[in-house]
Interface confidence: low
């Protein structure tokens, strides 16, 4: 997250860091009680690596007792999505168990009604992605609120040049922006999750370049269809 | 038209506690921080902390943290901040203010209350 | 904490001159610097964010600049109306900090 701040502790009992070998790689959002929801692209050079799901943490390295590591079960990604495009870029990880719930675990409502958030929207974005250009990683969860793009402005040419269809929502990116290592994580509008991280190589911070996030309105139906 | 309407003067005997109010009109309440800012002659401005209106969280100033509590009530789109074991060096001007997003994201403390003056005295 | 030094807590002008107002950060705060000007008896208000851009309505007279630890907030040609304190406040890391003021007086 560049130009947020550190998050209040365990306010975002949602928060998933998708972690790759004991290491955090990804954001993720806990959307039902054994299933966390990512970015497909995260587990693209996962290839024999052990993918776990930390739920319950504010800081990645210190003891907190609601911390708990999972096991995947299964992941689950989209079927249509692929390495080199930034479309369907989603992914269902299946927990080991049931997560355990409490004041710092939670799962986050979905929204299921597929219609544009508002332009100008203020949504909140989380992650343990980097706080700068020089790659700092963060050891506590960062956040920022970001106003909502209309997808006209984020498809003019300057911008994402017509990559932003239907099924993506856009948020400004003027030195506050989500970034490396926040892909998979949740933007929350109004409390509900509206979009998730897209996983490509950005660049952060810079306005003509805003962040990208897969609409989860548009996926309702496949989401449904991995949790039944 | 954004307003930020706060509450008027207090008088307070040394020790006691004072709870002042900030209410906001014209734009989404729960969807900007709001500050909390102290003017005293003797040290200018000073950020005391801010409140997420929509979860609640707050950020102090190490400095304030024990002598101001923030809080809101979304119903009424109202911002509160507690002063609690008051003494003359509490006697200012407390300022709340809000950021605001002008379509390139964060501006400054775009918006100020007007200013509620608290003063402390046996 | 980072500290925003304001040097001059007085500067004395004409109407019409050029002014320059000084604010130096205690470490690079990466341009996220804003101006604030209080005139007596009012809350402050906002003129300059990000060091270097406008706030709507504020008068192009008005121009702010800097990076790294030194800013300035530039009036071109000040008019009698600007008579006031300014501020320059930090919005890099918190807690927000702000410079001491200075005050602007016209000869």
């Known amino acids: 997250i560049l130009g947020g701040r550190e998050a209040e502790a365990h306010a975002r009992p949602y928060m998933a860091s998708v972690q790759l070998n004991g290491a955090h790689l990804c954001g993720g959002v806990l959307v039902a009680e054994q299933w966390v929801l990512s970015a497909a692209h995260c587990l693209e050079d996962a290839a024999d690596g052990k993918v776990q799901v930390l739920l319950g943490a504010h800081s990645l390295s210190q003891p907190e007792p609601s911390k708990r590591l999972y096991d995947v079960l299964r992941a689950v990604p989209h079927p249509d999505s692929q390495p080199d495009t930034i479309d369907h870029d989603l992914l269902l990880l299946q927990l080991s168990e049931k997560a355990t719930l409490g004041p710092a675990v939670r799962p986050l409502p979905w929204q299921r009604v597929d219609r544009d958030v508002a332009p100008g929207t203020l949504c909140d974005v989380a992650g343990w992605g980097i706080v700068n250009h020089a790659g700092r990683r963060p050891d506590s969860l960062q956040h920022v609120l970001l106003p909502v793009l209309d997808r006209a402005t984020c498809n003019r040419r300057t911008h994402h040049d017509g990559a932003i269809t239907e099924r993506l929502m856009c948020a400004e990116s003027n030195r506050r922006d989500s970034c490396k290592g926040d892909s998979g994580g949740p933007l929350v509008c109004g409390g509900v999750l509206e979009g998730v991280v897209t996983s490509g190589s950005r660049v952060c911070g810079n306005r003509k370049k805003p962040g990208i996030y897969t609409r989860v309105a548009s996926y309702a139906a496949w989401i449904d269809s991995v949790l039944a | 038209e954004v307003q930020l309407q706060q509450s008027g003067p207090e008088l307070v005997k040394p020790g006691a506690s004072v709870k002042i109010s900030c209410k906001a009109s014209?734009?989404?309440?729960?969807?900007?921080?709001m500050n909390w800012v102290k003017q005293s002659p003797e040290k200018s401005l000073e950020w005391i902390g801010d409140i997420n209106p929509s979860t609640g969280g707050t950020t102090y100033n190490q400095k304030f943290k024990a002598k101001a509590t923030l809080t809101v009530d979304k119903s009424s789109s109202t911002a509160y901040m507690q002063l609690k074991s008051l003494t003359s060096e509490d006697s200012a001007v407390y300022y709340c203010a809000t950021p605001y997003y002008y379509g390139s994201s964060y501006v400054g403390f775009a918006y100020w209350g007007q200013g509620t003056l608290v003063t402390v005295s046996a | 904490d980072i500290v925003m030094t304001q040097s001059h807590k007085f500067m004395s002008t004409s109407v019409g001159d050029r002014v320059s107002i000084t604010c130096k950060a205690s470490q690079d705060v990466s341009t996220a610097v804003d101006w604030y000007q209080q005139k007596p008896g009012q809350s402050p208000k906002l003129l300059i964010y990000?060091?270097?851009t406008r706030h709507t309505g504020v008068p192009d007279r008005f121009t702010g600049s800097g990076s790294g630890t030194d800013y300035t907030l530039t009036i071109s040609s000040v008019q009698a109306e600007d008579l006031a304190l300014y501020y320059c406040q930090q919005h890099y890391s918190t807690p927000w900090t702000f410079g001491g003021g200075t005050k602007l007086e016209i000869k």
């Open positions: 990000w060091a270097s």
């Open positions: 014209g734009y989404s309440f729960t969807g900007y921080y």
